[in-house]
């Protein structure tokens, strides 16, 4: 998965109402014992920085060593910096931990760009702003890396929350969340609320700001509005889902739905952008261009190379279309749609040279490995990874950035036939790149 994302809302901003919150709806679903309610200690436990990932504080070893760890639903290894590196403020020192156990086994993880390698072991791990438990988990101690750690990102490791099938070196290495569920009474479910800022943040603002919440073992209903809609997890490797229809401002892209999931569609908190297969990307850009044709944007903007800027507070959100992805529902022939705003897919960027303006990067890009629903999508929604019931839930996030005219939405049901045909069956070969 590509690291990347953007960050939270703060109050006290003059100008446009970037951070409007939606009121809580009153029609609640019936409580599911032990799975819903309040998780006060876990709310606001994530921080992050634009394009560089959301991280949670974790402790490793005895006595505990505190590290910031990137939350990544697109990989399955718990891996931490364990040697000095120019981009790391701190790292895991195994020799200082009395509970560290060496597995005498190496791990090498190549990505499309870059790699990390290290030594496998186990140690005691806990999440200070998480469930009050300590688990013995597999840890990859990263001893060498290339293009992995990000200068100034403030995280020192990665928490892969996907399934064992894509763990390295192989699926026998139990991922952290599996260990947590096995060793404790924590329900087999977690949920993420990633809060995009709607404006760029400098380093000091990032360190002082809230980036969202990872609720481990449950659902906190203060974090969303309306109802949760669930889509099946197609296969337990990545968090794979099926997209059955795509609309730009309500206009169907009219593609064979297999194209939307070629070669897979995944929900990935470790990727910044909404990434789309080449054909879908081209059709989507063509449609977004047409919808926003009152202004002429440079070709480089659609490529993610050029920024576009407007005088502070004058961004014409209304000229940009909303994007709806229809996801397979839990009931036969039933789908639901999630709709994001330009406030999600135009990523605010701070540039000293143009600091008097509000500048943005187009955060939809082309993929050769299928659709990746990265932060651009997730920042609009509260996303429930219900592993126990093999499904992913979406509801409108209480912290999503919007304006007075439009909000993100989760709506259904819609009748959609032959949705199974939308899934692409990958020829069985080893997936050799997680980070694409």
């Amino acid at each position: 998965t590509q690291h990347g994302i953007r960050l939270p809302l703060r109050s006290g901003l003059g100008g446009a109402p970037l951070g409007l919150r939606l009121p809580r709806e009153t029609d609640e679903e019936p409580e599911e014992p032990g799975r819903r309610g309040s998780f006060v200690e876990m709310v606001d436990n994530l921080r992050g920085k634009s394009g560089q990932g959301y991280y949670v504080e974790m402790t490793v070893g005895s006595p505990p060593q505190t590290l910031n760890i990137l939350v990544d639903t697109g990989s399955s290894n718990f891996a931490v910096g364990a040697a000095p590196h120019p981009f790391l403020h701190r790292y895991y020192q195994r020799q200082l931990s009395s509970t560290y156990r060496d597995l005498r086994k190496g791990v090498y993880v190549p990505y499309t760009q870059g790699k990390w390698e290290g030594e496998l072991g186990t140690d005691l791990v806990s999440i200070p702003h998480g469930p009050n438990v300590t688990v013995r988990a597999n840890i990859a101690a990263i001893t060498e890396s290339d293009k992995f750690f990000i200068n100034g990102s403030n995280w020192e490791g990665i928490l892969g929350l996907a399934y064992a099938e894509i763990a390295r070196p192989d699926d026998s290495l139990e991922p952290f969340f599996d260990s947590l569920v096995k060793q404790t009474h924590v329900p087999n479910l977690f949920s993420l609320q990633l809060c995009g800022a709607g404006f760029p943040l400098n380093q000091s603002e990032v360190l002082a700001s809230v980036g969202g919440s990872m609720i481990i073992g449950g659902i906190d209903h203060s974090l969303y509005t309306g109802s949760l809609w669930y889509t099946p997890i197609r296969r337990e490797w990545y968090y794979e889902v099926i997209i059955v229809r795509v609309e730009i401002n309500g206009q169907d892209l009219k593609m064979d739905c297999k194209e939307y999931n070629y070669d897979k569609s995944i929900v990935d908190s470790g990727t910044t952008n909404l990434r789309l297969p080449k054909k879908v990307f081209e059709a989507a850009v063509k449609s977004i261009k047409a919808a926003s044709s009152t202004e002429k944007f440079p070709d480089g903007f659609w490529l993610g190379e050029q920024l576009v800027c407007w005088q502070a507070g004058t961004t014409p959100w209304n000229i940009f279309p909303v994007i709806s992805l229809y996801l397979m529902g839990e009931v036969t022939n039933q789908s639901f749609r999630i709709t994001i705003l330009p406030q999600q897919y135009l990523r605010p960027v701070e540039d000293v040279a143009t600091s008097q303006d509000d500048c943005y990067k187009f955060a939809i890009s082309q993929s050769s490995t299928g659709t990746v629903m990265g932060a651009v999508i997730m920042e609009g929604f509260y996303v429930v990874f219900d592993r126990a019931r093999k499904r992913i839930g979406f509801a409108v996030s209480a912290c999503h950035v919007h304006d007075e005219f439009r909000t993100a939405a989760v709506e259904g049901p819609f009748v959609t036939l032959d949705m199974e045909d939308c899934g692409y069956n990958i020829p069985q070969t080893d997936e050799s790149t997680l980070m694409t």
Partner: antibody, heavy 116, light 107 residues
């Protein structure tokens, strides 16, 4: 403060090649594309191409027909341009420039002199 | 490729004057034009982006205007340090192209 550092000058023989560097600092290197621009003595500016340091995607000016190859080394936040089969026509100042809106930041340029 | 034409290679002006440098694109580039100032032997210094927006720190005597195919950089109250070369650039489509430059000279 954004800075792009380039060596001042390179003297090279005709028919050989040269690797020019551009070390970036003051921003997250992988967040912005890097461009290269050529300026022959007393002449205008010519865009050579660009590279996205996050995934090594490149785009070149087709007029220059394989004359340059762009690479990056993210571990040192450095963009490189390899110019091959040098002739007197390649004697020029080569600038790196960071994207944003147009090119808000430029390196000081490297003067390449092709001389026997 | 889009051709950017700065028809005047040289322009004569005096300190304190107002001068307009023009640039014409061979096809519609919207407002995706930048202007740079270059002192001989130095790198170009960015002045204007999006046809009319000043980069941070650029004095307000520099004003950009235009859209489509015709663009103008106006310098009011010309200072001695402005007697250098100015280039326009289109960044609307690849390959990015520059005008041939206009040098301001003392009358």
């Amino acid at each position: 403060e954004v800075q792009l550092q380039q060596p001042g000058a390179e003297v090279v023989r005709p028919g050989t090649s040269v690797k020019l560097s551009c070390k970036a600092s003051g921003y997250t290197f992988t967040n912005y594309w890097m461009h290269w621009v050529k300026q022959r003595p007393g002449q205008g500016l010519e865009w050579i191409g660009m590279i996205d340091p996050s995934d090594n995607y490149t785009k070149y000016n087709q007029k220059l027909k394989g004359k340059a190859t762009l690479t990056v080394d993210t571990s040192s936040s450095t963009a490189n341009m390899h110019v091959n089969s040098l002739t007197s026509e390649d004697s020029a100042v080569y600038f790196c420039a960071r994207s944003g809106v147009a090119f808000p930041y430029w390196g000081q340029g490297t003067l390449v002199t092709v001389s026997a | 490729d889009i051709l950017m034409t700065q028809s005047q290679k040289f322009m004569s002006t005096s300190v304190g004057d107002r001068v307009s440098v023009t640039c014409k694109a061979s096809q519609n580039v919207g407002r995706n034009v930048a202007w740079y100032q270059q002192i001989s032997g130095q790198s170009p210094k960015p002045l204007i982006y999006s046809a009319s927006h000043r980069y941070s720190g650029v004095p307000d005597r520099f004003t950009g205007s235009g859209s489509g195919t015709d663009f103008t950089l106006t310098i009011s109250n010309v200072q001695s340090e402005d007697l250098v070369e100015f280039f326009c650039q289109q960044y609307n489509s690849y390959p990015y192209t520059f005008g041939g430059g206009t040098k301001l000279e003392i009358k």
